[in-house]
């Protein structure tokens, strides 16, 4: 084993960790569990304890990211570098980052949780044997109802354990149809659809109607993602395998390596490869998040790489189902922290729960259990009619307005709205806006005309925010909201459409609150807002001063900048940082002098 220069280590034994965000590759509960098990490896042999917390004060902040992701060590795309971690210390030190360009699994293929069937929700086992054939993705073979299913053990023929895979034919998510399955075909804008579609939406989410006519009934849901058959590479990345498909006149109902010399599995993304030539690679085994995390946490605790090939801290990934820690790993971590004080616990014996009654459902019959649980997310509006066009990339061609003293941002007393868009701060006032990038000697650029960049907007804005994942921009003015995706606009829409009652005269600000969620402010009140659903949770209404004690009650703008919350009143701001799950005012200052670095003359 090796430790870092100077034996870098934590000087307390109660280590905290925060899971800042998640990969889409695995259910959140599986990710939570993988990290908890990875930490448990180290706590089992040392005096260390690991406690999950929900704030960035944590000793170890865990983050999924791609390429340039906020530190000086960008990731390299799929394969190669899987993750990295910083040695113990304050700030970013001790943090662990995972490359989300990898396929994260538990080391044995994509994790597809099942519903119904007879396997108590166990995940699919890929590959599995059914009627003597090997399947590396969910299949509809053996069924007449088109429902995809999988075996939850390596061999269905011998074990008879199965479940149904996520499928729009079984259920939908969110939407406004209580999770009912898709109805195919369905009519949307006069056209017939026999599969999920992204038409009418600008965010790329696949949806379907849950009745035969969306135009009439306006009932819809979002289609579940199928990790097992979402292809990579080829010429259809991100699309789904279509089974069965025809290749060289032969029908395939599972991924195949036919036609390739390298043995890699592929599938067609239409029913006929011969005519359409659309294809992609099927998901591989993926990397075990548990094993990679256990290795990275070793770094985060102070271990460098080991020269022992069997050790967890050896620098090469190797999937194993045996105990991951080698004696060398144990010696290394104990060199830093000492042994666990009490007697070592016996390894837990894990037993697979067995059903108490013989299964009553097999893949040749329909599921006997119907979905009973409602989707957890609130209702969303119908898909917005008509595609809104791709975002316009590249620099803006905004016009600079002729300069007069009032056009210098430093001479603006009170801005209408302020928002962090991309990595710049945008400041809006009376039909104009300025851009500001923090840096020594930086000055706000502009003014530019709002009408040049966002022609649909009014001159006076109350608040603006960018949703980072989709890059959507929300502009609020009075009782209306406009949503821009690139150059395409949806709106104006009334605030009622977001679930805000008639007593809400304006939205005065927004803060991020987890993935795809925001807090919307209006005067002294705030609500949780689901960006994808574009709907507030009416039950989430709260008083600002309960969540943010110490800020003024009559703020006219609330915005987020550099991960901190700013509450503006008059020319001043109250800056709030979150520490130990408490929101505390840590600075009061002038917008112009302290944020924009304007000279105080």
């Amino acid at each position: 084993f090796q430790t870092f220069e100077g034996d870098l280590k934590w000087h307390h034994h109660n280590i905290t960790y925060w899971i800042q965000n998640y990969s889409e590759d695995l259910p959140r509960a599986v990710i939570d569990d993988a990290f908890a098990r990875a930490f448990a490896l180290w706590s089992a042999v040392t005096p260390l304890t690991f406690t999950r917390v929900y704030s960035r004060d944590a000793d170890i902040v865990i983050q999924f990211g791609v390429a340039e992701h906020g530190d000086g060590y960008p990731f390299d795309g799929k394969d190669g570098l899987l993750a990295h971690a910083f040695p113990p210390g304050p700030g970013i030190q001790g943090d662990a980052h995972f490359d989300d360009d990898e396929l994260w699994s538990l080391g044995k293929g994509v994790v597809v949780p099942t519903r119904f069937g007879n396997a108590d929700g166990a995940a699919c086992h890929f590959p599995f044997i059914f009627e003597g054939r090997s399947y590396s993705a969910c299949t509809t073979d053996g069924r007449s109802d088109g429902l995809p299913w999988c075996s939850t053990t390596a061999n269905y023929d011998t074990d008879d354990r199965f479940g149904f895979c996520p499928s729009e034919r079984l259920y939908t998510q969110d939407g406004n149809a209580d999770g009912k399955p898709c109805q195919f075909p369905f009519i949307f804008q006069g056209q017939s659809y026999s599969a999920c579609t992204t038409d009418g939406r600008s965010d790329g989410y696949r949806w379907c109607a849950t009745t035969a006519n969306y135009d009439r009934d306006k009932l819809f849901g979002f289609c579940p993602t199928r990790a097992d058959s979402t292809v990579m590479g080829g010429n259809s990345a991100g699309e789904l395998c279509v089974f069965p498909f025809t290749f060289l006149g032969k029908e395939y109902s599972t991924c195949t390596s036919e036609g390739r010399g390298d043995g890699r599995l592929w599938c067609a993304t239409t029913s006929n490869f011969d005519s359409d030539k659309k294809w992609g690679f099927c998901p591989d085994q993926g990397y075990s998040l548990f094993l990679v995390a256990a290795h990275e946490f070793g770094h985060a605790l102070g271990l460098d790489h080991s020269s022992v090939p069997e050790a967890l801290m050896y620098p090469m990934y190797r999937f194993t189902e045996g105990p991951p820690l080698h004696k060398d790993d144990v010696n290394g971590i104990r060199h830093l922290y000492g042994p666990r004080p009490e007697p070592e616990p016996r390894p837990p014996t894990t037993t697979t729960p067995q059903p108490t009654a013989p299964p009553t459902v097999c893949p040749t019959g329909p599921p006997t259990v119907h979905p009973s649980e409602r989707p957890t997310a609130g209702p969303t509006g119908p898909p917005s009619a008509g595609p809104t066009g791709p975002p316009t990339a590249g620099p803006s061609t905004a016009t600079t307005v002729p300069l007069s003293p009032v056009d210098d941002a430093c001479n603006v007393n009170i801005f209408d709205a302020i928002a962090e868009i991309g990595n710049q701060l945008y400041l809006f006032k009376d039909g104009k806006y300025w851009r500001f990038s923090e840096g020594r000697g930086s000055r706000p650029q502009g003014p530019f005309l709002i009408a040049d960049k966002w022609p649909a907007l009014p001159r006076k804005l109350d608040s603006v925010f960018e949703e980072r994942l989709s890059k959507k921009l929300f502009f609020f003015s009075g009782r209306q909201v406009w949503v821009y995706t690139g150059a395409s606009v949806l709106g104006p829409r009334r605030l009622d459409k977001l679930g805000l009652g008639a007593d809400v005269a304006q939205v005065t600000g927004a803060l991020r609150s987890g993935r795809g969620k925001m807090l919307l402010f209006s005067g002294r009140r705030l609500w949780r807002f689901d960006v994808k659903a574009q709907m507030v949770d009416p039950r989430s209404a709260s008083e600002v001063d309960r969540m943010f004690p110490g800020v003024p009650l009559d703020t006219h703008d609330v915005f987020q900048y550099r991960e901190k919350a700013y509450f503006c009143q008059d020319r001043f701001y109250w800056r709030v940082s979150s520490r130990s799950e408490l929101n505390q005012v840590d600075q009061v200052g002038y917008v112009t002098y302290d944020i924009l670095q304007c000279p105080e003359d």
């Epitope: 870092f4 530190d71 390299d76 795309g77 190669g80 899987l82 304050p90 923090e438």
Partner: antibody
Framework: EVQLLESGGGLVQPGGSLRLSCAAS???????PMWWVRQAPGKGLEWVS?????????FYADSVKGRFTISRDNSKNTLYLQMNSLRAEDTAVYYC?????????????????WGQGTLVTVSS | DIQMTQSPATLSLSPGERATLSCRAS??????LAWYQQKPGQAPRLLIY???YRATGIPARFSGSGSGTDFTLTISSLEPEDYAVYYC?????????FGQGTRLEIK
Amino acid sequence: EVQLLESGGGLVQPGGSLRLSCAASGFTFSTYPMWWVRQAPGKGLEWVSYIYPSGGGTFYADSVKGRFTISRDNSKNTLYLQMNSLRAEDTAVYYCAKDRAYGDYVGWNGFDYWGQGTLVTVSS
Amino acid sequence: DIQMTQSPATLSLSPGERATLSCRASQSISSFLAWYQQKPGQAPRLLIYDASYRATGIPARFSGSGSGTDFTLTISSLEPEDYAVYYCQQRGNWPITFGQGTRLEIK
């Protein structure tokens, strides 16, 4: 003994191309990220490009993006920089440098070995 | 991009004196800072990595300190061979950036 030896520099006209090479020895080349850093006459240091050990991840300074391509051949222990559409402002001494950091341990920030540099002059 | 500002631009000191070179980052870079020495016609040479660790073969008179935004390179007693240009470089955020350099000259 670690050695990095650049070659391929010279005089080229604006719009022209050059290919720089950097032969590495004395360390396990395939384990370390590598860099190209340049220095215009009388000026400071500026990073140009960065490549991961496997060659899978490549990164470029905005000033050269779309014109320069970094690559490596781990079997030959050699780093390359293909420079196209050269401009007068690309005139500089080009250094290849070895990263101290490696793999998934992010620390040890610094370039611990540098080549002697090769001069690229872009002029008509 | 993070700006690195070195001061002073030029430092004139006699052999045996203590040299203190400063480097300031426009935002926090934790301890991801390196110092290099460059003599005319030569490649840069790594002196300090991760703000305070001496690179292999660097004499003990060189030391680095600081974290966050303010960093210092100290040469406790100048030797004739120490006169050169010194650069700091950050890797707290992408892309990496270098300071503009401090020229250390004989007084």
